[in-house]
């Protein structure tokens, strides 16, 4: 039975040209995390593998940085970066936990962080 929950940074906004940290946290489970994937729609951004460490997808190697922790830092943001981002925790023996973050990249300087929320 999957008992864990993923807490994410929720709906967030940031300025064009700036950077943003995407964060997820898996709690309420003793399952072992084997890898965490970060994906934007169907596009792989990064993988953190328990044995090998971080891999940034080569298409994003110049503007995605690993961390902090299991989070991901997006740099040099463009309006095209607006959209859904998913943290996918692969665990044993529980299986897969997925968290969702919506990022809006704004042209103006009125970028505010949304509230944190939980996805069971």
């Amino acid at each position: 039975m999957m008992t864990g929950t993923i807490e994410t940074t929720g709906n967030i906004s940031a300025e064009k040209g700036g950077s943003i940290i995407l964060q997820c946290h898996l709690s309420s489970t003793t399952a072992q995390v084997t890898q965490v994937n970060w994906e934007q729609q169907d596009q792989l951004l990064a993988i953190c593998n328990a044995d090998l460490g971080w891999h940034i997808s080569p298409s994003f190697k110049d503007r995605v940085a690993p961390g902090p922790g299991l989070g991901l830092t997006l740099q040099s943001l463009t309006v095209n970066d607006t959209g859904e981002y998913f943290c996918i925790y692969h665990t044993y023996p529980d299986g897969t936990y997925t968290g969702r973050i919506f990022l809006e990249v704004l042209e103006s300087s009125v970028a505010e962080h949304g509230a944190r929320f939980q996805i069971p």
Epitope: Q35, S57, P58, K61
Partner: antibody, heavy 126, light 108 residues
Amino acid sequence: QVQLQESGPGLVRPSGTLSLTCAVSGDSISSSNWWSWVRQPPGKGLEWIGEIYHSGNTNYNPSLKSRGTISVDKSKNQFSLKLTSITAADTAVYYCARARVYDILTGRGYYGMDVWGQGTTVTVSS
Amino acid sequence: SYELTQPPSVSVSPGQTARITCSGDALPKKYAYWYQQKSGQAPVLVIHEDRKRPSGIPERFSGSSSGTMATLTISGAQVEDEADYYCFSTDSSGNPRVFGGGTKLTVL
């Protein structure tokens, strides 16, 4: 530690078929790796031939023009290369290698070929 | 077909810095890998994903990538570093994977 050992005939006749096997020890052929073949003609550089993932997915060098087939034998913990319509240009040292990946489910996130066999020499001659 | 271009040879004196370049049109959006092959031996992975060094590889080996050029740097080259060095990457569609022509490093 992980070891790879190539085996096969040292001499192949032109127009024949080359069959090579790579025995894997210290790791499971079913683990999350690309199992690869690379060759090196005498006095020349390295040439990537192709690879197979434990799921059965394969990638090949287009220059082989569909002459190559890579397969896995899980019961023997080994993988193989078959190359048809052999010519003198296929004379080379053939290496097998393990390429690790970060995404253990899909094979995405290429780490690199971190373990190699010592190579086996194949000569094509009549 | 996709190509990676390397200089055929590079020579340095012991203790000097050796730089081996690799150029390819897809390198801005692909990773470069570097393999060392000493005479009569199998290749060894010395740099992966542009700049990462596998465990057991000396710190004098480093990698970098900028635009269409990847560079392997050996800081304080030693006689035992004399070998052929191959860059390796993929084309813009992900496959096939391809080796550069190789660079013979002479340390004398």
